[in-house]
Interface confidence: medium
């Protein structure tokens, strides 16, 4: 349905307050440096502009498309070329190719500094200014995450604001917020981790990608849906997600809100799950529709294999109509296994499409692919073999000591990664132990694997900025459903050339007595990649040995009355004693 | 729910023609595989003809292939089943069946399809 003008469009569907701050999440996500009140001036001038747009649509300008109207935005920022130096270059192109090159421009990993929560700070920002906290915390997130899913931010920024609501007014204001933002920073974490796996699958692997994990995905949800309303449901969600991670955020929201209408009107047919959410006002209803557990599988569903290996139809069902049939194969495969990953599902699929391939082309195709289930074990066996291997470690380990496992197996595969990379990446999988672990056998594959996806997915994008490991890269672009499997699979690097030793690295001050647990960890974990780096060789006793060592320094000269002192005469002791060990 | 209605059938003599019809209510017949099977006395059903939902893939038994064609016609949600040459071991029940929300496959196996009609009676006999 085409409007005259585009922006009034939007500003009428969305409403001023969820059209600010999409305009203002999409400002902040393309120009990650600079200040807030520079970013609500801008927002500022195109809502007045949508206003006037609204009271008349004819009014000059107002049928401008939506690219055009932001990219001219922020082509007025005067200190473009200073702060982005070759973005300003892409204020010389015509649309479409000038919103191109400014979602080329976006920086996964933006030189910002950490949000360190100070409770009273906060409770007086909010309570000056509710609206602005608002936006604070919008432009704040967006900045740093620049493929945070837009209308989900929205969700989180409200939510942000209502523990402020509830806390500001509590007696130990820190005991209130800080283990309720810290709950909602892990789950923000985890939220942008997933769109950026969802937008790096589109970008590297096109919308295909997207549609058959969401046919999976959806599939395991709703497994009472038919095929054609679940394959509905996946061509307006890619719709969606297409748009978001292509900066189109007010489109992106709206389609998002006429979605989550959609399925509340026909949840009869999709899910007996759904009645909650759909009481819910939009956001909540969208968030809850997104976290919806997996409803019932139907009974008496008849055996995949009927369909899919004793049928003698199969290679002309195939042949005549390969998307359909595969995507029939996923998605009756995805709802009778609620237990399975989708990343297996997805190389279940594969597997089957690579099967049929062979099968199809030979005088007796029935015979070749009446076994293909048997052929398929053995992707589900993989996974679960890992899952109990890892676990078993984690739980003799616990996270801290997992995580450290974690960064020798990882720092000798890929030794030419950046430390703060190694370190990064190896401390989120060692998280999995934390949240995957514990969970029931039922749910461990699906926590595991997924998460595994965007932890992987992490590394290849930061990877993609500077490529140093034509291993990473390999696994990173062959097979997006095979890249964990890959990595996996990675043995240690024989061709690396060790890194001279350098003391400045081990070289440590008092100010890192005073730091939090988990900073003197990362510390610690980056000593640790840094001396494998050095020694890749270092057999596990020896290891051992250095970081007890190290941490024997730390904690005798964080004790000492003059710790600068301490540091500066034990340090130098602790690299000699350090290649000692290593010797 | 899928409510599905043959008629057609009838007493044709061998070599004649007869067109059956199936008209579907409760969901478009285009989004549903959909086929016909047929039923002797004292004999089990037996697959004769199919067309997938969303694709118009056509599946047929060996014994009808060439003679029966298996069509739809969506704006009417009616499935057909034309049939030419027939013999006198074509005499049986002739059933509509219904496998919603399936893409394009059209299994052979009865059990597989949730949905049928009452039947419609086809006898080829001089």
């Known amino acids: 349905d085409t409007h005259k003008s585009e922006i009034a469009h939007r500003f009428k569907d969305l409403g001023e307050e969820h059209f600010k701050g999409l305009v203002l999440i999409a400002f902040s996500q393309y120009l990650q440096q600079c200040p807030f009140d520079e970013h609500v001036k801008l927002v500022n001038e195109l809502t007045e502009f949508a206003k006037t747009c609204v009271a008349d649509e004819s009014h000059a300008g107002c049928e401008k498309s939506l690219h055009t109207l932001f990219g001219d935005e922020l082509c007025k920022v005067a200190s473009l070329r200073e702060t982005y130096g070759d973005m300003a270059d892409c204020c010389e192109k015509q649309e479409p190719e000038r919103n191109e090159c400014f979602l080329s421009h976006k920086d996964d990993s933006p030189d910002l500094p950490k949000l360190k929560p100070d409770p009273n700070t906060l409770c007086d920002e909010f309570k000056a200014d509710e609206k602005k906290f608002w936006g604070k915390y919008l432009y704040e997130i967006a900045r740093r995450h620049p493929y945070f899913y837009a209308p989900e931010l929205l969700y989180y920024a409200n939510k942000y604001n209502g523990v402020f609501q509830e806390c500001c007014q509590a007696e130990d204001k820190g005991a209130c917020l800080l283990p309720k933002i810290e709950t909602m920073r892990e789950k923000v974490l985890a939220s942008s981790a997933r769109q950026r796996l969802r937008c790096a699958s589109i970008q590297k692997f096109g919308e295909r990608a997207l549609k058959a994990w969401s046919v999976a995905r959806l599939s395991q949800k709703f497994p009472k849906a038919e095929f054609v309303e679940v394959t509905k449901l996946v061509t307006d969600l890619t719709k969606v997600h297409k748009e978001c991670c292509h900066g189109d955020l007010l489109e992106c929201a709206d389609d998002r809100a006429d979605l989550a209408k959609y399925i509340c009107d026909n949840q009869d047919t999709i899910s007996s799950k759904l009645k909650e959410c759909c009481d819910k006002p939009l956001l909540e209803k969208s968030h809850c529709i997104a976290e919806v557990e997996k409803d019932a599988i139907p009974e008496n569903l008849p055996p995949l294999t009927a369909d899919f290996a004793e049928d003698k139809d199969v290679c002309k069902n195939y042949q005549e109509a390969k998307d359909a049939f595969l995507g029939s194969f996923l998605y009756e495969y995805s709802r009778r296994h609620p237990e399975y990953a989708v990343s297996v599902l997805l190389r279940l699929a594969k597997e089957y499409e690579a099967t049929l391939e062979e099968c199809c082309a030979k005088d007796d195709p029935h015979a070749c692919y009446s076994t293909v289930f048997d052929k398929l074990k053995h992707l589900v066996d993989e996974p679960q073999n890992l899952i109990k291997q890892n676990c078993d470690q984690f739980e003799k380990l616990g996270e801290y000591g997992f995580q450290n496992a974690l960064i020798v197996r990882y720092t000798r595969k890929v030794p030419q990664v950046s430390t703060p990379t190694l370190v990064e990446v190896s401390r989120s999988l060692g998280k999995v132990g934390t949240r995957c672990c514990t969970k029931p056998e039922s749910e461990r594959m699906p926590c595991t694997e997924d998460y595994l996806s965007l932890i992987l997915n992490r590394l290849c994008v930061l990877h993609e900025k500077t490529p140093v490991s034509e291993k990473v890269t390999k696994c990173c672009t062959e097979s997006l459903v095979n890249r964990r499997p890959c990595f996996s699979a990675l043995t240690p690097d024989e061709t690396y050339v060790p890194k001279a030793f350098d003391e400045k690295l081990f070289t440590f001050h008092a100010d890192i007595c005073t730091l939090p647990d988990t900073e003197k960890q990362i510390k610690k974990q980056t000593a640790l990649v840094e001396l494998l780096k050095h020694k890749p060789k270092a057999t596990e006793e020896q290891l051992k040995t250095v970081m007890e060592n190290f941490v024997a320094f730390v904690d005798k000269c964080c004790a000492a009355d003059d710790k600068e002192a301490c540091f500066a005469v034990e340090g130098p002791k602790l690299v000699v004693s350090t290649q000692t060990a290593l010797a | 729910e899928v409510q599905l209605l043959e008629s057609g059938g009838g007493l044709v003599q061998p070599g004649g023609s007869l067109r059956l019809s199936c008209a579907a209510s409760g969901r478009y017949i285009d989004e549903t595989a959909v086929a016909w099977f047929r039923q002797a006395p004292g004999k089990g059903r037996e697959f004769v003809a199919g067309?997938?939902?969303?694709?118009?893939?056509?599946y047929y038994a060996d014994s009808v292939k060439g003679r029966f064609t298996i069509s739809r016609d969506n704006s009417k949600n009616t499935l057909y089943l034309q049939m030419n040459s027939l013999r006198p071991e074509d005499t049986a029940v002739y059933y509509c069946?219904?496998?919603?929300?399936?893409?394009?496959?059209?299994?052979?196996?009865?059990?597989?399809?949730?949905?049928w009609g009452q039947g419609t009676l086809v006898t080829v006999s001089s």
């Open positions: 067309i997938g939902g969303g694709v118009d893939i056509t």
């Open positions: 069946a219904a496998r919603p929300g399936r893409p394009l496959i059209t299994s052979k196996v009865a059990d597989l399809y949730p949905y």
